[in-house]
């Protein structure tokens, strides 16, 4: 697994460097997670033809993956820092059950899948410190998550492969949109 942000050899070699600001730390954390997703997508795409499949709609019916919309305040039109931050944190919390599903879905990248999951938890903590309106953030219901996980794990092999592909793709796109918005804050 890759070394978490702030622990690479470059950091050790430069002890006099300015400490990262909160925004820089968040930026670096998201890029680290995106690197992890890239590695996982590589394994998924090499293992099956899911990345070229046009039958995504079949699997998407079972998923309710978080997605950015205009009303979320993360795009230039209607940009709203607080609304957007709430959407980013809420979305990441909703992705957690899907990241749990990804565990045990990889053979050669098992550590990488765990690193993506753990790094996302750290990212949520960073973002919660940044948010002023924590009351607006809704946490997913654990019982609902548990039954969703069971349902996903009970799918046939093809649907499980497609679900894995869709989760990685959607999570990547959500993080990209989130980081673009965070860079405006």
């Amino acid at each position: 697994a890759p070394v978490p942000p702030g622990e690479d050899s470059k950091d050790v070699a430069a002890p006099h460097r300015q400490p990262l600001t909160s925004s820089e730390r968040i930026d670096k954390q998201i890029r680290y997670i995106l690197d992890g997703i890239s590695a996982l997508r590589k394994e998924t795409c090499n293992k099956s033809n899911m990345c070229e499949s046009s039958k995504e709609a079949l699997a998407e019916n079972n998923l309710n993956l978080p997605k950015m919309a205009e009303k979320d305040g993360c795009f230039q039109s209607g940009f709203n820092e607080e609304t957007c931050l709430v959407k980013i944190i809420t979305g990441l919390l909703e992705f957690e059950v899907y990241l749990e599903y990804l565990q045990n879905r990889f053979e050669s990248s098992e550590e990488q899948a765990r690193a993506v999951q753990m790094s996302t938890k750290v990212l949520i903590q960073f973002l919660q410190k940044k948010a002023k309106n924590l009351d607006a953030i809704t946490t997913p219901d654990p019982t609902t998550n548990a039954s969703l996980l069971t349902k996903l794990q009970a799918q046939n092999q093809w649907l499980q492969d497609m679900t894995t592909h869709l989760i990685l793709r959607s999570f990547k796109e959500f993080l990209q949109s989130s980081l673009r918005a965070l860079r405006q804050m």
Partner: nanobody, 124 residues
């Protein structure tokens, strides 16, 4: 890393249009976020616009909003900047840039590949 080549610059009358192109070599073009920056004589390079991989997240600098339009064609590996109602203060060297993380943003540091630039001169 990808190679970027800008074209379409030139001399244009104030109020006129111009379309810049940025041609990208590399099969991964469709995964990159792309941006346009510009540098006027004696000034810092500044952000103009950026676009994500599937064109659903586009940002513009306030100074060009409503006049410039950024777009891309992933099948042709090209990004465009349609500039309308040009003003003398738009005179600059225009650079295209690519971000391999697919994010983009208003700072130079967010991009890992750059073109050589194309000169745009707007005469009054």
């Amino acid at each position: 890393e990808v190679q970027l080549v800008e074209s379409g610059g030139g001399l244009v009358q104030a109020g006129g249009p111009l379309r810049l192109s940025c041609t990208v070599s590399g099969r991964t073009f469709s995964t990159y976020a792309m941006g346009w920056f510009r540098q006027a004589p004696g000034k810092e390079r500044e952000f103009v616009a950026d676009i994500n991989w599937n064109s659903d997240n586009i940002w513009y600098a306030d100074s060009v909003k409503g006049r410039f339009t950024i777009s891309r064609d992933n099948a042709k590996n090209v990004m465009y900047l349609q500039m309308n109602s040009l003003k003398p203060e738009d005179t600059a060297v225009y650079y295209c840039a690519a971000d391999s993380y697919g994010v983009g943003g208003g700072k130079e540091e967010y991009y890992d590949s750059w073109g050589q630039g194309t000169q745009v001169t707007v005469s009054s």
